[in-house]
């Protein structure tokens, strides 16, 4: 048994870290695999992750941890029964992605306005609370050219757009995803999308 | 350092009950962990009770023996772990321990307890008429 | 729940003697084992987790090895402060449970 791309792993930055990894060949991870991880500290334990199938030859493995700060590190190892097929270490810190933001809501009761809304998905005390930059994507759901990017660099997660600028008796579709400047992390996954129909009609003197 | 503190042992009466606290520091008893009770009866073997894990999903796993007489419990904001115990017996007689334990893991939500890696000193209870 | 059935329940043995003590699950709980040591009036320490694992400032003449149903503990070299009561810890991954042995107590000779 052969590990033919080693593990990488990316944090949350607040309580999971998740690895992945491929092997040589078709592999049914949960049985034959192990993943280790330990806590670089004196008295933490050793706790084993079950991996699960990611593809024929993928595997994927969350790591459950504390809530992460910036000098953690972790040792991995990965085991096939009593064989040690690879040894590592992680810096949560250092490879952050994002949770997805959430409770994507739009608000089309202002007549001329459509409001975004959606939720920080992070608690107040978490050090990327307040760190946290957005790209709204909306698109028109039929017709997959007409879509477009709005970056939100300030805090408040919300997105005011004049509904003029969109076509009008058209279905829309959005979504959000974010990312945290000061901690040079990739971005999120995408959150659930949204749909609403733009039924903004422009005043009669301007058609 | 870190460390687990039992309190609540002592002497209570057969039927009644008793609550055992067990108060961490040096760590977050919040954390990515499990939480347990081990109980050793006078000159006998350790037998394991149950577990409570610390994170947010809070799920506890009891020894078949256990389940219903004994309940773990615990208090995040003051890094404490409870074992309330009812209806005692004098069999339950025993010196208990607090543990931190490690974890198995599948996915986020499955998550069961391992080995025992930090311990107590003990509280001594006895069940005596 | 699992059974782990320990031997021998007690043995006698000099300083410098190679002792043996093994642990027996009733179902396979792959490398879920875990070695204690507990001397009187004192909490169980924690010498060999995952069945093999030398646990942080644990000294190398403790060992272990097996996996499934199968485990052994092996102190190469007894030293006066070995003489204790050892605990197999088995962890069923089926039902959550963990079940120790009866306990070996190693006495002086």
């Known amino acids: 048994m052969k590990v033919l791309q080693e593990p990488t792993c990316v944090s949350d930055y607040m309580s999971i870290s998740t690895c992945e990894w491929k092997m040589g060949g078709p592999t049914n991870c949960s049985a034959e695999l192990r993943l280790l991880y330990q806590l670089v500290f004196q008295s933490s334990e050793t706790h084993t992750c079950v991996p699960e199938n990611n593809g024929g030859v993928g595997c994927v493995c969350h790591l459950l941890m504390d809530d992460v700060v910036s000098m953690d590190n972790y040792t991995l190892d990965l085991w096939a029964g009593q064989q040690l097929l690879w040894k590592g270490s992680f810096k949560p810190s250092e490879h952050v992605k994002p949770r997805a933001p959430g409770n994507l809501t739009v608000h089309t009761n202002v007549s001329d306005t459509v409001l975004l809304t959606w939720s920080n998905p992070y608690p107040p005390d978490n050090y990327l609370y307040n760190d946290l930059t957005y790209a709204v994507n909306i698109w028109n759901e039929n017709d997959l050219a007409d879509s477009r990017i709005h970056n939100v660099t300030y805090l408040k997660p919300t997105l005011r757009i004049p509904a003029s600028t969109l076509k009008s008796g058209i279905s829309y579709r959005a979504r959000v995803r974010a990312w945290a400047q000061h901690y040079n992390t990739t971005w999120s996954e995408w959150s659930p999308s949204t749909k609403w129909y733009n039924s903004y009609r422009e005043p009669f003197e301007q058609r | 350092e870190v460390q687990l503190v039992e309190s609540g042992g002592g002497l209570v009466q057969p039927g009644g009950s008793l609550r055992l606290s067990c108060a961490a520091s040096g760590f977050s008893s919040s954390s990515a962990h499990y939480m347990c009770w081990v109980r050793q009866a006078p000159g006998k073997g350790l037998e394991w009770i149950g577990c409570i894990y610390a994170g947010s999903r809070g799920s506890t796993y009891y020894a078949s023996w256990a389940k219903g007489r004994f309940t773990i419990s615990r208090d995040n904001s003051k890094n404490t772990v409870y074992l309330q115990m009812n209806s005692l017996r004098a069999e339950d007689t025993a010196v208990y321990y607090c543990?931190?334990?490690?974890?198995?893991?599948?996915?986020?939500?499955?998550?069961?307890?391992?080995?025992?890696?930090?311990w107590g000193q003990g509280t001594l209870v006895t069940v005596s008429s | 729940d699992i059974q782990m059935t320990q031997s021998p329940s007690s043995l006698s043995a000099r300083v410098g003697d190679r002792v043996t003590i093994t642990c027996q699950a009733s179902?396979?709980?792959?490398?879920?084992l875990a070695w204690y040591q507990q001397k009187p009036g004192k909490a169980p320490k924690l010498l060999i987790y995952r069945a093999s694992t030398l646990a942080y400032g644990v000294p190398s003449r403790f060992s272990g090895s097996g996996s499934g149903r199968d485990f052994t503990l092996t102190i190469s070299s007894l030293q006066p402060e070995d003489f204790a009561t050892y605990y197999c810890?088995?962890?069923?991954?089926?039902?959550?449970?963990?079940?120790f042995g009866q306990g070996t107590k190693v006495e002086i000779k």
């Open positions: 810890l088995g962890s069923s991954y089926s039902t959550g449970s963990n079940i």
């Open positions: 179902e396979d709980i792959e490398s879920y």
């Open positions: 543990a931190r334990a490690a974890f198995v893991n599948r996915g986020v939500s499955w998550i069961w307890p391992y080995y025992f890696s930090l």
